[in-house]
């Protein structure tokens, strides 16, 4: 059976600045094309690594036990995780070198729960989004972003941390998910695949997109990331899918044009400040939201994920640059840096718009299978 056709006004149709086309039926895999949880990828399918908020700008996270090792926040995923693996297994490996920092990779040993027990939690990210099952929540208002249009100076740090490319954001970028739900942006990073292989973290009805951007935020209720980890709503991530379009995306080009300078793992450069909001879809009113986790160790839960319905368009050349320029650990290309989708375990994904509406003529009254939870509580 084919997946339902996505119309202009239906989930993930239409893109930033009206440049992208809605996803048509031909863009979506049939059921047999969809990745199967029971079919983990081979070794070559395993993505690289990943990391979280602000790196050395952030305080240490104290390890739960000796076995975990000293987990510093710079070792955390920028709210990201492993590849097309098909089990909720998250494996990490400890690098013998280095200064007692935890290093892990997708698909290696030891299993992630040994690095951080939270990785075996019940409410992990990323997840597969099924719009038909999303609960329409009229209480979910358009996102509000303030101060995201940065001037060229001061410059920002762009770093290849071995598992993603991360842009550290300056103070002053404020985001509100709704009244009383205020956050400050810390950093953004990307997830991608490899040639001909998509690499988004979240999926939509099993469809994986070429890439995904994450903008990581700290709740204003907390002064430090380590205080917020594991607390409900302590961290919030804005996520958007990146798709191929006919034109170069000038906002992304400001970052992608600099990747050659940081091809080597651990290298960094400075880039002019830019309009961070231009990296996101233009429609801040239509999104999916759920509570999940960081997508790499320490896999802390309580993270509010907001996944835009609208996608962002990059040219084929830009997507190739993203997936084919950077190098990760051990002389391997930094590719497929995404985590397998995790089970919802009863969680309900909310939508700020009626995502479950079937646009075909015979659909009279849409059936909403899930009811909206009290948003903003």
């Amino acid at each position: 059976q084919r997946l339902p056709r996505m119309q202009e006004d239906s989930p993930l149709g239409g893109g930033s600045s009206g440049e992208d086309d809605p996803l048509g039926e031909e863009d979506l895999p049939s059921e047999e094309d969809s990745p199967r949880e029971e079919d983990p990828p081979g070794e070559e399918d395993l993505p690289g690594e990943e990391d979280l908020p602000g790196e050395e700008d952030l305080p240490e996270v104290k390890p739960k036990s000796e076995e975990e090792g000293s987990l510093k926040l710079e070792d955390l995923p920028t709210v990201e995780a492993p590849g097309d693996p098909q089990e909720p297994q998250n494996n990490a490996h400890r690098d013998k070198e280095g200064d007692d920092q935890s290093h892990w990779r997708y698909g290696g040993d030891p299993p992630w729960p040994r690095v951080s027990p939270a990785c075996a939690g019940r409410f992990q990210s990323p997840v597969d989004i099924r719009p038909q099952l999303a609960a329409f929540c009229p209480a979910l208002r358009p996102l509000e972003l303030l101060g995201f249009q940065l001037p060229p100076l001061p410059e920002l740090r762009l770093r290849n941390n071995g598992h993603s490319v991360q842009l550290t954001l300056p103070p002053g970028l404020e985001m509100a998910l709704g009244p009383g739900r205020e956050y400050r942006a810390l950093q953004l990073h990307l997830h991608w695949g490899a040639a001909g292989r998509p690499g988004s973290e979240h999926t939509v009805e099993g469809h994986r997109f070429p890439a995904e951007i994450h903008v990581v935020h700290l709740s204003t209720a907390f002064a430090r990331v380590d205080e917020a980890l594991g607390r409900p709503g302590g961290l919030a991530v804005l996520a958007a899918f990146l798709e191929e379009g006919p034109e170069e995306n000038s906002a992304y080009e400001q970052l992608l044009s600099r990747l050659e300078e940081i091809a080597e793992e651990g290298s960094e450069t400075q880039v002019p400040g830019l309009d961070i909001s231009a990296l996101l879809p233009s429609d801040f009113s239509r999104y999916f939201q759920y509570e999940g986790s960081l997508t790499t160790p320490p896999c802390a839960q309580g993270v509010i994920w907001t996944v835009f319905n609208q996608t962002v368009m990059l040219s084929a050349k830009q997507l190739h640059t993203l997936s084919d320029t950077l190098w990760g650990p051990g002389d391997s290309r930094l590719q497929l840096n995404f985590r397998a989708t995790q089970p919802l375990n009863g969680r309900v994904i909310e939508a700020s718009f009626p995502a479950g509406v079937d646009s075909s003529p015979r659909a009279a009254e849409p059936v909403q299978l899930n009811s909206c939870l009290a948003a903003g509580d």
Epitope: Q149, P151, P152, L153, P154, E155, S250, Q254, Q270, V271, P272, L274, D275
Partner: antibody, heavy 124, light 107 residues
Amino acid sequence: EVQLVESGGGLVQPGGSLRLSCAASGFTFTDYYMHWVRQAPGRGLEWVAFIRNKASGYTPQYSASVKGRFTISRDNAENSLYLQMNSLRAEDTAVYYCVRGGHAGSNYWYFDVWGKGTTVTVSS
Amino acid sequence: DIQMTQSPSSLSASVGDRVTITCHVSQNINVWLSWYQQKPGEAPKLLIYQASNLHTGVPSRFSGSGSGTDFTLTISSLQPEDFATYYCQQGQSYPFTFGQGTKLEIK
């Protein structure tokens, strides 16, 4: 008085090298990004390179046309800016200006103080 | 790279005239644009920064406007010392680029 004075220009053969210097005075040199901008005879202005200020680690940035051939550096104790030019080509012939632009309080790059320039001629 | 296109390339005007020079940019640069004046044998001088801010010591007859991709430099009443070449420059991202220049000549 804020001042920039270039020196070191001259005639050089293709493939040769030259080192330009710029003496800065009248301002806190380490606070500023410093640039080289050139102008070929009868042509427009072309940005060549800059070196960041103290707050940004004094790292360099180059235009594609000179990357790998030119090296920008600064001596903060001497309030001096340099441009080492190697593998010179005929198309590098220009007046080279030392320019101040961008500091801790700036929000973008504009060039507010220019030296008088020094002429580099690359010819056999 | 960001492309800058000035128009006109040259312009003849008389003392007292109001003159407008435009600068079109290939992509949105917000207000990160500057204007410079250059006289023969001299270095350029900054006139306007951030699209509309007058640099210290520049006469008030000079003004700048615009944002995004289209910018304008206006001289409200031309003076003899204003005959020169004018350049726009984007400071949004490197490589920093300049317009090709507009030569303002006496009619």
